[in-house]
């Protein structure tokens, strides 16, 4: 069992063509975060936020991914193919690795709700 806890935006939905914020928050630990990785459902890396080197957005996502707010990630110009799981991986010392999961559903409907409630 890990010392800390990852809180995420949980299951969220957003409109096709719109944007969404993916957020994770690490709490209940004194460990220092050296890097946060953001991965897509197929385990491809979207972006990295390194404590020393700053943000790196992977080339395939440069047009549609924006860093922040904070350690979070903003996905823009959403397509139906963006539906799926997203993972934040916190690399910390001395605790090791923490991993959070978010499920994003992209909806065609104009009544798509963007739920951004935090849940553990």
């Amino acid at each position: 069992m890990m010392t800390g806890t990852i809180e995420t935006t949980g299951n969220i939905s957003a409109k096709k063509g719109g944007s969404v914020i993916l957020q994770c928050h690490l709490s209940s630990t004194m460990a220092q975060v050296t890097q946060v990785n953001w991965e897509q459902h197929d385990h491809s890396l979207l972006a990295i936020r390194n404590a020393e080197l700053g943000w790196h957005i992977y080339p395939a996502f440069k047009d549609r991914v924006a860093p922040g707010p904070g350690l979070g990630l903003t996905l823009q110009s959403l397509t139906m193919n963006d539906t799926g799981e997203y993972f934040c991986t916190y690399h910390t010392y001395p605790d090791g690795t923490y991993r959070g999961r978010i499920f994003l559903e992209v909806l065609e409907s104009s009544v798509a709700e963007h739920s951004a409630r935090f849940q553990i």
């Epitope: 069992m1 010392y93 090791g96």
Partner: antibody
Framework: QLQLQESGPGLVKPAETLSLTCTVS??????????WTWIRQPPGKGLEWIGT???????FHNPSLKSRVTIPVDTSKNQFSLKLSSVTAADTAVYYC??????????????WGQGTLVTVSS | DIQMTQSPSSLSASVGDRVTITCRAS??????LNWYQQKPGKAPKLLIY???SLQSGVPSRFSGSGSGTDFTLTISSLQPEDFATYYC?????????FGGGTKVEIK
């Protein structure tokens, strides 16, 4: 098979800077999942953690060594180093480099170099 | 800093004996306790991590237990190659600290 190899002078004069290098083979020092560590052992005594570094340069060190420690990383050479300034005879020890293992919470030191003895003497 | 205290500091035992080494932390470290074996002139070798998990390749005669502040390393049947010094180490928080070691000698 991952291997770590320490190198550097075996004799350092008091008040000078001790410099050691750890070369990692069989794996990448740039791995996001690993941290890299220096540990020392004075002759006939126990183990002391010196400090730990991430590939990007984030460093954690033992407060007992105050600001004497720096741990640079050279990812192009797959190496990390130890620089300990203002050394005294009390810094005489076998110095080990080690990897902080992945995949478990609060990971241990799972791979170690063979160690190198550094003597501080004039 | 978290102090790690090992006992005994040394012990004499015979091949086939059951050997128990204890390690006590000055505050709770949950199960973040690791055990290492060191032979003269060699680097320490990881035996047990997370208090009770056996590192790959380590014989099953080695086992670990405990949580909180009190931990135990047990060698169920001492073999000739087990005569060495054993160290506990906490990976709960920095600074990382080790116990003073327990030297297991031949009786």
């Amino acid at each position: 098979q991952l291997q770590l190899q320490e190198s550097g002078p075996g004799l350092v004069k008091p008040a000078e800077t001790l410099s050691l290098t750890c070369t990692v083979s069989g794996g990448s020092i740039s791995s996001y999942d690993h941290y890299w560590t220096w540990i020392r052992q004075p002759p006939g005594k126990g183990l002391e953690w010196i400090g730990t570094v991430y590939y990007s340069g984030s460093t954690f060190h033992n407060p007992s060594l105050k600001s004497r420690v720096t741990i640079p990383v050279d990812t192009s050479k797959n190496q990390f180093s130890l620089k300990l300034s203002s050394v005294t005879a009390a810094d005489t020890a076998v110095y080990y480099c080690a990897r902080v293992g992945p995949d478990v919470s609060h990971p241990p030191f799972d791979y170690w170099g063979q160690g190198t003895l550094v003597t501080v003497s004039s | 800093d978290i102090q790690m205290t090992q006992s005994p500091s040394s012990l004499s035992a015979s091949v086939g004996d059951r050997v128990t080494i204890t390690c006590r932390a000055s505050q709770s470290i949950s199960s973040y306790l690791n055990w290492y074996q060191q032979k003269p002139g060699k680097a320490p070798k990881l035996l047990i991590y997370a208090a009770s998990s056996l590192q790959s390749g380590v014989p099953s005669r080695f086992s670990g237990s405990g949580s909180g502040t009190d931990f135990t390393l047990t060698i169920s049947s001492l073999q000739p190659e087990d005569f060495a010094t054993y160290y506990c180490q906490q990976s709960y928080s920095t600074p990382i600290t080790f116990g003073g070691g327990t030297k297991v000698e031949i009786k």
